[in-house]
Interface confidence: medium
């Protein structure tokens, strides 16, 4: 899982993605439910190798929460070909797995 | 306790249409994918197709295209399956189910559908 | 579209028996997912993620593959190991196997 500090790292990161599902967990150290569902964002990480995982930290990446429109903690988006494919908010470990699995 | 409770058994005539539904206690539908399942008498099992509750995003395979509509009312913690233009080869057993990733999925316990003149 | 191709069709098998029943994907998956049915009754999830068993299943039962060649296998078939079984695939779009038919010898 690669933590991404900058607009620039993160634009980086969805360029070099190129055809590959990429995962991104907006979240927040103050915010319990990401705290939850870290391990298990770290576990999918290594379950799915051909997935790029992403974990942004809201308070230190304003500028991407704002671009990406982020409203609430925890948001995940997907994006393939840096184009965003999907998007949901809460911290559901099912739900996450089974829209990984649909949009790989 | 996850329970998902589908609606009785239905005998229709063919080229009528059919609305099953299934009721789910012990989670909220806008959490997950709901999915429906076809099995035909002593036949295997055919994925149908699933909704995201929480937006209505559906997606079927290909087959069932135009076959079926599945939709959700999130108030009342209900998925429906409708099939229309029915024919003797949708006399199925149509469960709905919660397909999880984890140790444990839960399905309904199936409405049989007859198409009988 | 994934298929997945499941062999034999049918099988019978005596009590203590080795039982070992395959399924072949058209593409490379990443998780098989195997299902017990028995008559009149809803599938049951049976094996997750390849090889891990569900809850209650029993420790004779296992499973295992990767790539497009995944098998379920009971070390020593007991009469209520008698049903049919189906892998299942998670792909964008599910798939299931046509099912092996297990009966008791």
């Known amino acids: 899982v690669k933590q991404i500090e900058s607009k620039t790292a993160f634009q980086e990161a969805l360029d070099a993605a190129g055809d590959k599902l990429v995962v991104v967990d907006f979240s927040a150290t103050w915010c319990g439910p990401c705290k939850m569902i870290k391990p298990f964002f770290h576990s999918l990480s290594e379950k799915y190798s051909n997935v790029i995982f992403l974990e942004v930290d809201v308070d230190d990446c304003q500028d991407v929460a704002s671009e990406c429109e982020v409203k609430c903690m925890i948001t995940f988006q997907f994006f393939k070909k840096g184009q965003k494919v999907g998007e949901f908010s809460g911290a559901n470990k099912e739900k996450l797995e089974a829209t990984i699995n649909e949009l790989v | 306790e996850v329970q998902l409770q589908q609606s009785g058994a239905e005998l229709v005539k063919p080229g009528a249409s059919v609305k099953l539904s299934c009721t789910a206690s012990?989670?909220?539908?806008?959490?997950?994918?709901m999915h429906w399942v076809k099995q035909r008498p002593e036949q295997g099992l055919e994925w149908i197709g699933r909704?995201?509750?929480?937006?209505?995003?559906?997606k079927y395979d290909p087959k069932f295209q135009g076959k079926a509509t599945i939709t959700a009312d999130t108030s009342s913690n209900t998925a429906y399956l409708q099939l229309s233009s029915l024919t003797s080869e949708d006399t199925a057993v149509y469960y709905c189910a919660l397909l999880q990733y984890s140790a444990m999925d839960y399905w309904g316990q199936g409405t049989s559908v007859t198409v009988s003149s | 579209q994934i298929v997945l191709t499941q062999s034999p069709a049918i099988m019978s098998a005596s009590p203590g028996e080795k039982v070992t029943m395959t399924c072949s994907a058209s593409s490379r998956i990443s998780y098989m997912y195997w299902y017990q049915q028995k008559p009149g009754t809803s599938p049951k999830r049976w094996i997750y993620d390849t090889s891990k068993l569900a809850s209650g299943v029993p420790a004779r039962f296992s499973g295992s593959g990767s790539g497009t060649s995944y098998s379920l296998t009971i070390s020593t078939m007991e009469a209520e190991d008698a049903a049919t079984y189906y892998c299942h695939q998670r792909s964008s779009y599910p798939t299931f196997g046509a099912g092996t038919k297990l009966e008791l010898k």
């Open positions: 012990g989670f909220n539908i806008k959490d997950t994918f």
């Open positions: 909704i995201d509750p929480a937006n209505g995003n559906t």
